[in-house]
Amino acid sequence: SIPWNLERITPPRYRADEYQPPDGGSLVEVYLLDTSIQSDHREIEGRVMVTDFENVPEEDGTRFHRQASKCDSHGTHLAGVVSGRDAGVAKGASMRSLRVLNCQGKGTVSGTLIGLEFIRKSQLVQPVGPLVVLLPLAGGYSRVLNAACQRLARAGVVLVTAAGNFRDDACLYSPASAPEVITVGATNAQDQPVTLGTLGTNFGRCVDLFAPGEDIIGASSDCSTCFVSQSGTSQAAAHVAGIAAMMLSAEPELTLAELRQRLIHFSAKDVINEAWFPEDQRVLTPNLVAALPPSTHGAGWQLFCRTVWSAHSGPTRMATAVARCAPDEELLSCSSFSRSGKRRGERMEAQGGKLVCRAHNAFGGEGVYAIARCCLLPQANCSVHTAPPAEASMGTRVHCHQQGHVLTGCSSHWEVEDLGTHKPPVLRPRGQPNQCVGHREASIHASCCHAPGLECKVKEHGIPAPQEQVTVACEEGWTLTGCSALPGTSHVLGAYAVDNTCVVRSRDVSTTGSTSEGAVTAVAICCRSRHLAQASQELQ
């Protein structure tokens, strides 16, 4: 029968008595930076080319006995997970292995850097089709390793890495913390985060998604026909590398940004029990388990968006946090969140020729997060329209006044320390959906975009009684681009997008009276692109 992990990543329409999805990633080459591997294992023979690259540290300890099968164990298993004949994800993918981990599974930053450079040079000398680089390793945070990953990613290479097995914030490790890398955490057959002894999978905002990583059957280096079960975020990353190979084989022109957005879009949503994660990491950790798309073609019509959280600002009075989109993505909205509720909002601003989302801490606040909504919107022309604090008591308003521009997000930012403590809520006048409304003391920022066929609408959900969380979701066929809270509710901690749902969080309801002050309204801006839909129909 099909192993649980392959069943989990396979859409139901492909499930037969054996796993045989269309096109096995045959147009893609996957580079594996790991231990040595037994490349003639029955499961992977002819699929893996062992390069002559080797850069590993000496094994520790005088009594260490270098046993070939142990030296090959980790890499052989991962190669099998990516492209194995019977237990692999992308059965048609060809692989190249570089040895950067020794027989104890240890490597160095310098060895990995030189390995990445070897790949870059190979790519320049002999350009092939799409490349995926699998980095099933994790070490302490390294600015230089992250920079090397960024360079390779900007050269068009897809890098996939393990989040790490330290039951810790993945942002503290490299290459997991590199924004350009697709970072993968591990889940088990019950879709729960993987526990490994006293530790387990890493988590947090630097993780892009999770994938099967416990009791994964794959090639064993103990013999040429042996299989073994292994666990960890390396195995999870290997699944995503395989899925990426399948997607790129079906659509070789996909950019890294497009691939990442598709991986997120086609993942299983909200299946992970977040209670396993530390409380402060739950909101930051994506509740996504990787899966193959139900059809490897025809996803181009959708407007893809993802949520990017910033690092924590820190508690100082003037602290700010910045969230950035990838180079090929458009920032369509910006929101902020603070656990203490003390924040001064957020705004979109230009930085290095690109819009970023900046959130501002308030006096007495424990710090804030900026939350960017990053979308793929070809031929988009986006700008931010700002209205300074208004004199009138009606509040501040701003709308998209340029012809053909639509509202994709609203942000508000204020200078006073505790805005709205004794202010009544400001309600958006009916019939004016294409504008942002805020407190008169706040400056309001509207994200206005023009793109072929782009249409957006505002959807609100208000709850009169106090509630810790209010949500509003976009309907099927529409994509959430903006998420904010209607102003006037002082106890709002912030707003953020989770998949296609806008979430507005408030302080513990027990501390809030049930007056109108307790009312919370979540405002979602939902968009779709008729142009993308038409283009995909023409292509099919």
């Epitope: 008595d17 045989q20 037994q38 490349s39 003639d40 002819g46 004949r85 019977d86 059965k91 026909t225």
Partner: antibody
Framework: VQLVQSGAEVKKPGASVKVSCKAS????????ISWVRQAPGQGLEWMGW????????NYAQKLQGRGTMTTDPSTSTAYMELRSLRSDDTAVYYC????????WGQGTTVTVSS | ESALTQPASVSGSPGQSITISCTGT?????????VSWYQQHPGKAPKLMIY???NRPSGVSNRFSGSKSGNTASLTISGLQAEDEADYYC?????????FGGGTKLTVL
């Protein structure tokens, strides 16, 4: 990609035979070598596999104890030795690339006769 | 391991299609994606025609196709030609080794 085998052999019962198979045109360590035999007028029988990477072997149960498969990476050559020959070992012996057996040698005829 | 079961012979006229079956168990054909088919002309070495159930090596005519259902694999040859007359063998992984079918003699009438 090519596998070239040694020439025909005639042996007496109880003797040993060693057939060679020289590989070229591909990365040796990416594939082992399978040995297959075919008795006159009969079907194909898989005998076993040997690794160029680490010399590991995987023998068919029927061959256990009587056969030895080895490789010499320095000469890109695989060997199959069969001891205590019997008349029913008369066959054409083929080497083939890997478990996938996508490339075959030309075959070596071994005749066991008193 | 027991040999996989193939019909001893099949025949067909030029231009016709024929199918050769190969039946095993869940421990071989049914348990792996690695069923291969070989063509052998008299006095010649076998030639790989299909690998991993349904894949064709480069250079093999698209008249040859493979499939599998449960514990039975099949080789189909369409548009039969005189040069297709040969012996055909299926092969499958088992947990630790490899097993061939007994062979099928294809006669082109």
């Amino acid at each position: 990609v090519q596998l070239v085998q040694s020439g025909a052999e005639v042996k007496k019962p109880g003797a040993s035979v060693k057939v060679s198979c020289k590989a070229s045109g591909y990365t040796l360590t990416s594939y082992g070598i399978s040995w297959v035999r075919q008795a006159p007028g009969q079907g194909l029988e898989w005998m076993g596999w040997v690794s160029f990477y680490n010399g590991n072997t995987n023998y068919a149960q029927k061959l256990q104890g009587r056969g030895t498969m080895t490789t010499d990476p320095s000469t890109s050559t695989a060997y199959m030795e069969l001891r205590s020959l019997r008349s029913d070992d008369t066959a054409v012996y083929y080497c083939a690339r890997g478990y996938g057996m996508d490339v075959w040698g030309q075959g070596t005829t071994v005749t066991v006769s008193s | 391991e027991s040999a996989l079961t193939q019909p001893a012979s099949v025949s067909g006229s030029p231009g016709q299609s024929i199918t050769i079956s190969c039946t095993g168990t869940s421990s071989d054909v049914g348990g792996y994606n690695s069923v291969s088919w070989y063509q052998q002309h008299p006095g010649k070495a076998p030639k790989l025609m299909i690998y991993e159930v349904s894949n064709r090596p480069s250079g093999v005519s698209n008249r040859f196709s493979g499939s599998k259902s449960g514990n039975t694999a099949s080789l189909t040859i369409s548009g039969l030609q005189a040069e297709d007359e040969a012996d055909y063998y299926c092969n499958s992984y088992t947990s630790t080794s490899m097993v061939f079918g007994g062979g099928t003699k294809l006669t082109v009438l």
